[in-house]
């Protein structure tokens, strides 16, 4: 038969950061290939990654059409060298993914400190707004465009000469903090969606940036 010795995929897992979304699964294929289908709860199935020997499929193009929808994917297994035949009635083995809601579940990518500027005893720290693959009228949207006030940033800052950290929060991409004159400070930021109740609430910390290096500017 058309599906002899094919095994169903398993461990279907969504990997998603800033809406770049890939479905991964097992096993590595031996004499079989896979096709992925994706659907919203109310929509039709759309096939992607036809007869692939990979164990991942980039579904970003589908989910960015509506990041607030809930998606389901399934992975079909076919014998290697399979050619679609109109006469075949036997359904190949397949496995369903967990449901995936991008807006609630995509991980926040590592943020980047764009710049910092010192004026007297104040420092303005600016976080770079990351671009996503979500579009509006053929224009790519930033993370802030998508999440708006749902997205905040936490700034960790400390004197270069000590380890005691202070924190500040902003619902924009800028911080204005007080510093001691004559002291150098180091900074790291983290993106946070406070409304989330799960492990993907926070990003990893940005790379540390310290005063006295090229990203900074100092004015009296």
């Amino acid at each position: 038969s058309g599906t002899t010795n094919t095994v169903a995929a398993y461990n279907l897992t969504w990997k998603s950061t800033n809406f770049k979304t890939i479905l991964e699964w097992e096993p590595k294929p031996i004499n079989q290939v896979y096709t992925v289908q994706i659907s919203t709860k109310s929509g039709d199935w759309k096939s992607k990654c036809f007869y692939t020997a990979d164990t991942e499929c980039d579904l970003t193009d589908e989910i960015v059409k509506d990041v607030k929808q809930t998606y389901l994917a399934r992975v079909f297994s076919y014998p290697a060298g399979h050619v679609e035949s109109t006469g075949s009635t036997e359904e190949p083995p397949y496995e369903n993914s967990p449901e995936f809601t991008p807006y609630l579940e995509t991980n926040l990518g590592q943020p980047t400190i764009q710049s910092f500027e010192q004026v007297g005893t104040k420092v303005n720290v600016t976080v770079q707004d990351e671009w996503t693959l979500v579009r509006r009228n053929d224009t790519f949207l930033s993370l802030r465009d998508v999440f708006g006030k749902d997205l905040i940033y936490t700034l960790y800052y400390w004197k270069s000469s000590s380890s005691g950290k202070k924190t500040a929060k902003t619902n924009t991409n800028e911080f204005l903090i007080d510093v001691d004159k004559g002291e150098n400070y180091c900074f790291s930021v983290q993106a946070v969606i406070p409304s989330r109740r799960t492990a993907n609430r926070k990003s990893t910390d940005s790379p540390v940036e310290c005063m006295g290096h090229e990203k900074g500017e100092s004015r009296e």
Epitope: K68, L104, T126, D129, D145, V146
Partner: antibody, heavy 120, light 113 residues
């Protein structure tokens, strides 16, 4: 078609409790904030608070914090606004609304309103 | 809290003539990350719930006639109606959609002469 359907008008006495509802349909209920807005007779709009049904996260206006509770049951796509002890000054039209698709893009859809009258 | 102040509180306009409503916020509504102003305009027609007209200060909601336009940045915003029609009567509200608590202006009542 996106719809928000609110429960019917209520007449209550001071000190009584009340829960009004807002049922969403035609969209993914868990991913959009439901907003609650008060309009006292002949007055303007006042934002009370909101809830993201997918996580249950809420925000309240300081003017309403502690006096009302916002909740949601995502299994039936319904948000609630409740009072444990009503006052005459709670007499108003209460609207639920749904946030827009993009971040901070306003309240794109509104319920028809629930008129609450509190009188002894 | 951000305070939203609208002027005028009422205006009476002849059909076909333009109308303009000002809204000032006590703090900037400009998001530094994406350079968007999170200012929203609504119209509440008599006996109806409000309806969204403009978000991001100048983006018209789908289905809103192009005679409505929004402009401004930071703390000063304007809603313009290029040619007022009878169906435009009602109360117009601006709203801070930038930061919690979200706040509305007092409203501007538009009447037809």
């Amino acid at each position: 078609e996106v719809q928000l359907v609110q429960s019917g008008a209520e007449v209550k006495k001071p000190g009584e409790s009340l829960r009004i509802s807002c049922k969403g349909s035609g969209y993914t209920f868990i991913t959009y904030w439901i907003e609650w807005v008060r309009q006292m007779p002949g007055k303007g709009l006042e934002w009370m608070g909101d809830i993201l049904p997918g996580s249950g996260s809420t925000n309240y206006s300081p003017s309403f914090q502690g006096h009302v509770t916002i909740s949601a049951d995502k299994s039936i796509s319904t948000a609630y606004l409740q009072w444990s002890s009503l006052k005459a000054s709670d007499t108003a039209m209460y609207y639920c609304a749904r946030s827009g698709y993009y971040g901070n893009s306003g309240f794109a859809y509104w319920g028809q309103g629930t008129l609450v009258t509190v009188s002894s | 809290d951000i305070v939203m102040t609208q002027t005028p509180l009422s205006l009476s306009v002849t059909p076909g003539q333009p109308a303009s409503i000002s809204c000032k916020s006590s703090q900037s509504l400009l998001s530094s990350g994406n350079q968007k102003n999170y200012l929203t305009w609504y119209l509440q027609k008599p006996g109806q719930p409000p309806q969204l007209l403009i978000y991001w200060a100048s983006t018209r909601e789908s289905g809103v006639p192009d005679r409505f336009s929004g402009s401004g940045s930071g703390t000063d915003f304007t809603l313009k109606i290029s040619r007022v029609e009878a169906e435009d009567v009602g109360v117009y509200y601006c709203q801070n959609d930038y930061t919690y608590p979200l706040t509305f202006g007092q409203g501007t009542k538009l009447e037809i002469k």
